[in-house]
């Protein structure tokens, strides 16, 4: 997956620190107070859709083949820059019942981005 | 995950049969000749981003909280209707060396869609 470096405008991973205090989640998340969750941004021109080797690759490659051949309904269906590899992270938080839980929460950190 | 029924225009899963002959892959895929791979389509208004209980939910919910509070750069970053649950399928195909391979290929079938 491509890293955003300010020079590219195609689908890439942008490093980003998520601060739980900024979104008011600090009243139920005990630790960490924030983390590098990152996000995906950038264009998905038709020639790169489904070519990332991402977890979506087989399906998105197939759909892209349909799109490239102008088959309805995919001709107008836009490919999207989305997380294709996410990583869990351990969190200490109050659950719905106000009990303190330490748990690995799935899909917290965006590791790679690709075109859907 | 929502199923597309022609009545909704928000993010949903559309049943779709992928025909390998149509995209010219029948010369290396022996079986099946096609399958229901489905795809995702529809709008992702801000209020449904990250509310699907999907595999993307933690990260997309966090990003949506930033987006709703108008924090740069998310205010203009669009949420996208993408596969959030995919299923493997068994395939019989010729590999690069023209050997016949039977293998479960990951992420072939879209099971659920959600907003990134």
């Amino acid at each position: 997956g491509l890293e955003c470096d300010g020079k590219v405008n195609i689908c890439c991973r942008q490093q980003f620190f998520i601060d739980f205090r900024l979104i008011g989640w600090n009243d139920w998340i005990i630790a960490p107070t924030g983390y590098y969750g990152n996000y995906c941004e950038g264009e998905c021109p038709s020639h790169i859709a489904g070519t990332s080797g991402s977890s979506l690759s087989f399906h998105s490659t197939v759909i892209n083949h349909y799109r490239m051949r102008g088959h309805s309904p995919f001709a107008n269906l836009k490919s999207c820059c989305v997380p294709t590899k996410l990583r869990p992270m351990s969190m200490l938080y109050y659950d719905d019942g106000q009990n303190i839980i330490k748990k690995d929460i799935q899909n917290m950190i965006v590791e790679e981005c690709g075109c859907s | 995950g929502l199923e597309c029924d022609g009545k909704v225009n928000i993010c949903c899963r559309q049943q779709f049969f992928i025909d390998f002959r149509l995209i010219g892959w029948n010369d290396w895929i022996i079986a099946p000749t096609g399958y229901y791979g489905n795809y995702c389509e529809g709008e992702c208004p801000s209020h449904i981003a990250g509310t699907s209980g999907s595999s993307l939910s933690f990260h997309s919910t966090v990003i949506n909280h930033y987006r709703m509070r108008g924090h740069s750069p998310f205010a203009n970053l669009k949420s996208c209707c993408v596969p959030t649950k995919l299923r493997p399928m068994s395939m019989l195909y010729y590999d690069d060396g023209q050997n016949i391979i039977k293998k479960d290929i990951q992420n072939m079938i879209v099971e659920e869609c959600g907003c990134s």
Epitope: D27, W28, D96 | I48, T51, G53, S57, H65, M68, R69
Partner: antibody
Framework: QVQLVESGGGVVQPGRSLRLSCAAS????????MHWVRQAPGKGLEWVAV????????YHADSVKGRFTISRDNSKNTLYLQVNSLRAEDTAVYYC?????????????????WGQGTTVTVSS | DIQMTQSPSSLSASVGDRVTITCRAS??????LGWYQQKPGKAPKRLIY???SLQSGVPSRFSGSGSGTEFTLTISSLQPEDFTTYYC?????????FGQGTKVEIK
């Protein structure tokens, strides 16, 4: 500590309107979904309406749809319920309730903190 | 809409008894169910969340079980303060719906 305080109830004639308010304190109001639940005298609990943390999404029970409107002002930490075209069957204690707008592994967070309630009596 | 059928509507029991209250959902709600206790003139208080987890600060004599469509609240040994009304709530899909309530009375 976390507190929800309802106000605005009273005795009102059928067909008239009221605006119920709920002042929230002790937590980040703008991060939580908020609900109204009511209870008619001697009866059970009835869920009335919900509003998303940011006001972007609302659901109302069929029994109040078109007559009641839930809203919020995050800058004032206040939840509202505009009740119009009141009927005798709307007579109840109205509770303001909090829930976290969050789900994980297909578990959707429920109602955790309740206010003490405000009484609406519809009578001619 | 999901209907929640709670039974019994009332029951008589003695201090120290074990009591069970049932809620049945008209369709599957996974574990998106809570149990609430309401004392006269007071707001409801949650006892059980996620069908079987004990709310912080609630005595361990209360327990919940079930998933899908069948749920139970059990009080292992009734205490004098437990004689009141109990409700289940499904929060799987809108509109959220409560059971009709169960009044636990002294025999």
């Amino acid at each position: 500590q976390v507190q929800l305080v309802e106000s605005g109830g009273g005795v009102v004639q059928p067909g008239r309107s009221l605006r119920l308010s709920c002042a929230a304190s002790g937590f980040t109001f703008s991060s939580y979904g908020m609900h109204w639940v009511r209870q008619a005298p001697g009866k059970g609990l009835e869920w009335v309406a919900v509003i998303w943390y940011d006001g972007s999404n609302k659901y109302h029970a069929d029994s109040v749809k078109g007559r009641f409107t839930i809203s919020r002002d995050n800058s004032k930490n206040t939840l509202y319920l505009q009740v119009n075209s009141l009927r005798a069957e709307d007579t109840a204690v109205y509770y303001c309730v909090r829930s976290r707008n969050w789900n994980y592994d297909n578990y959707y967070y429920g109602l955790d903190v309740w206010g003490q309630g405000t009484t609406v009596t519809v009578s001619s | 809409d999901i209907q929640m059928t709670q039974s019994p509507s009332s029951l008589s029991a003695s201090v120290g008894d074990r009591v069970t209250i049932t809620c049945r959902a008209s369709q599957g709600i996974r574990n998106n169910l809570g149990w609430y206790q309401q004392k006269p003139g007071k707001a409801p208080k949650r006892l059980i969340y996620a069908a079987s987890s004990l709310q912080s600060g609630v005595p361990s004599r209360f327990s919940g079980s079930g998933s899908g469509t069948e749920f139970t609240l059990t009080i292992s040994s009734l205490q004098p303060e437990d004689f009141t009304t109990y409700y289940c709530l499904q929060h799987n899909s809108y509109p959220w719906t409560f059971g009709q309530g169960t009044k636990v009375e002294i025999k």
